[in-house]
Amino acid sequence: SLAADTPTACCFSYTSRQIPQNFIADYFETSSQCSKPGVIFLTKRSRQVCADPSEEWVQKYVSDLELSA
C-alpha cells in the first residue's frame, strides 16, 4: 500500500539542550507507530529537532504553539 511505503518521521533520540523558544516556528508529534514518543520542532531556519515530550520545556512550547495557532 502507499501508506506502508511512506516513511513516518520518528526520533532515534532527543536533543539534550533546550532550544530558545523564539527559534521555534511549529511542531508536530511523532506517530504512535514510532518506537519512542517524540515532539519534532520546526525552527525558523527550517531545521527539525527531536525533543522529549516528557520534558517540561517541551510541553510548555507545545502549549504555547497551540494557543497561538
Epitope: 511505503d5 511512506t6 532515534f12 533520540s13 532527543y14 536533543t15 539534550s16 518506537s35
Partner: antibody, heavy 120, light 109 residues
Framework: QVQLKESGPGLVAPSQSLSITCTVS????????IHWVRQPPGKGLEWLGV???????NYNSALMSRLNISKDNSKSQVFLKMNSLQTDDTAMYYC??????????????WGQGTSVTVSS | QAVVTQESALTTSPGETVTLTCRSN?????????ANWVQEKPDHLFTGLIG???NRAPGVPARFSGSLIGDKAALTITGAQTEDEAIYFC?????????FGGGTKLTVL
C-alpha cells in the same frame, strides 16, 4: 562547516585496548548523535555503535562486551574504547554525525578515518 | 544478528539508469528499517546520500533516489554520470542497531 576528525594510536598490540577520539566542529553534540564505524582492509563497513545527545548509547551486539563510547560535550569530543584487540580488529575507524530524525540521512557527515593496526 | 546483502558489483554506462538493491535475511525491508545509502569514493571519502528509505541529503543530485522495491530497499541512479563510479553501502536499522550491507562496486564506463 561540519567537520569530524578521528585521532588514534595507529598501532596496538594484541590483547591491548584501543582508544580513539573524534573531535567535531560546525555542530553541537547536544543536537546530534555520533556513530562509530570501521572498515577492515579490502572489506565492507561494520557499525560499532552510537552515542546520543543525552549520553545514551546503542552498540553492535557482537562487540558490546568490548566497546565503550563516551563523550565530552564541552570539548566537542567523542571517545571510542575497545578492549582485548585481536588482529581482525585491524581496520580504518570512522566517526560520523547522526541526526536524530529517522527521515534524515542517519550518518550524513563522516570523518576521514584513522588507521588501526593490531600487531605485535 | 541480521545479514544485509547487496550486489557485489554492477556496471553501467553514462546516461543509463541503474538500480542497486539491499536485502535483509530477516524478511522484507520496510520503512521501519529506515534504509540509508552511503557512497564511498577513493581515499576513504564517505558521504551519506539517502536516509529514511527515500530522503536525499542536502546537496545530493536528484538523479539519486531511494525506494522499496518488492522486499528490498533500492537506490536508483537515473542518468548515471562517470563521477558516480564508487562503492555504495546500504544500512538498515533493526530496532536498536544498524547493519551495513557488503557494498556494491558500481563501475560507470
Amino acid at each position: 562547516q561540519v567537520q569530524l576528525k578521528e585521532s588514534g594510536p595507529g598501532l596496538v598490540a594484541p590483547s591491548q585496548s584501543l582508544s580513539i577520539t573524534c573531535t567535531v566542529s560546525g555542530f553541537s553534540l547536544t543536537g546530534y548523535g555520533i556513530h562509530w564505524v570501521r572498515q577492515p582492509p579490502g572489506k565492507g563497513l561494520e557499525w560499532l555503535g552510537v552515542i546520543w545527545p543525552g549520553g545514551g548509547t546503542n552498540y553492535n551486539s557482537a562487540l558490546m562486551s568490548r566497546l565503550n563510547i563516551s563523550k565530552d560535550n564541552s570539548k566537542s569530543q567523542v571517545f571510542l574504547k575497545m578492549n582485548s584487540l585481536q588482529t581482525d580488529d585491524t581496520a580504518m575507524y570512522y566517526c560520523a554525525r547522526g541526526p536524530l530524525i529517522t527521515t534524515e540521512v542517519s550518518m550524513d557527515y563522516w570523518g576521514q578515518g584513522t588507521s588501526v593496526t593490531v600487531s605485535s | 544478528q541480521a545479514v544485509v546483502t547487496q550486489e557485489s558489483a554492477l556496471t553501467t554506462s553514462p546516461g543509463e539508469t541503474v538500480t542497486l538493491t539491499c536485502r535483509s535475511n530477516t524478511g522484507a525491508v520496510t520503512t521501519s528499517n529506515y534504509a540509508n545509502w552511503v557512497q564511498e569514493k577513493p581515499d576513504h571519502l564517505f558521504t551519506g546520500l539517502i536516509g529514511g528509505t527515500n530522503n536525499r541529503a542536502p546537496g545530493v543530485p536528484a538523479r539519486f533516489s531511494g525506494s522499496l522495491i518488492g522486499d528490498k530497499a533500492a537506490l536508483t541512479i537515473t542518468g548515471a554520470q562517470t563521477e558516480d563510479e564508487a562503492i555504495y553501502f546500504c544500512a538498515l536499522w533493526y530496532s536498536n542497531h544498524w547493519v551495513f550491507g557488503g557494498g556494491t562496486k558500481l563501475t560507470v564506463l
